[in-house]
């Protein structure tokens, strides 16, 4: 950080490495929860028109797909991978692609993915071939 840019104590809006380098924040789709028509497809686009700068540079992009008897929703947000989201750890946060993994939630079908490339939660991937054989 240049000397004219103040350092701040205990502020997680500025992530630095051991050399004091500053991390650029992630750009993610961020529409919170929206109704979705994404169903029985290998991949879907979020149809979220808002790309937001994540508040904290350590945050990654997250997408949550939920289906119950009444509707399907898709949630797109930024989130810190050190913290659980919907009670689940973001285990794939370093992935460049948002590859959906099913999670156990009573009364609904629940898939979640996280990723760390710009707007990566715009394209959510359900296809098994990505989960197993795709190195990306």
């Amino acid at each position: 950080i240049p000397p004219h840019v103040q350092k701040s104590v205990n502020n997680d809006m500025m992530v630095t490495d051991n050399n004091g380098a500053v991390k650029f924040p992630q750009l993610c789709k961020f529409c919170d929860v929206r109704f979705s028509t994404c169903d029985n497809q290998k991949s879907c686009l979020s149809n979220c028109s808002i790309t937001s700068i994540c508040e904290k540079p350590q945050e990654v992009c997250v997408a949550v797909w939920r289906k119950n008897d009444e509707n399907i929703t898709l949630e797109t947000v930024c989130h810190d991978p050190k913290l659980p989201y919907h009670d689940f750890i973001l285990e794939d946060a370093a992935s460049p692609k948002c590859i959906m993994k099913e999670k156990k939630k009573p009364g609904e079908t629940f898939f979640m993915c996280s990723c760390s490339s710009d707007e990566c939660n715009d394209n959510i991937i359900f296809s098994e071939e990505y989960n197993t054989s795709n190195p990306d």
Epitope: P2, A21, V22, K23, F24, T51
Partner: nanobody, 124 residues
Amino acid sequence: EVQLLESGGGLVQPGGSLRLSCAASGFTFTEYRMWWVRQAPGKGLEWVSAIEPIGNRTYYARSVFGRFTISRDNSKNTLYLQMNSLRAEDTAVYYCAKQMPGQKWMAKSRFDYWGQGTLVTVSS
């Protein structure tokens, strides 16, 4: 020598407007995503807005969405931030910064990434 020179800051009343400029030189402006970053007294950096080098896709922090507008004039190597409906919490030093495609980190103490900043004070 790379230079980023911000201007346009000042004292403004809540609800007022300001337009910040950042004059860039010493590098190929059209190769960089450009950012506005701010730092309130005693606080960390807040990434306010960004704009792509070509095509002018823009991005905003949720705290400024709908109030601030980022733009660039590649023919003048200049970045702008139009700030409307200003609030006390927008008080900060505003810096422009540059980002190469794919770049994740900015090196420490590198003046070629940062300007000197311009102070915006929102107060009645």
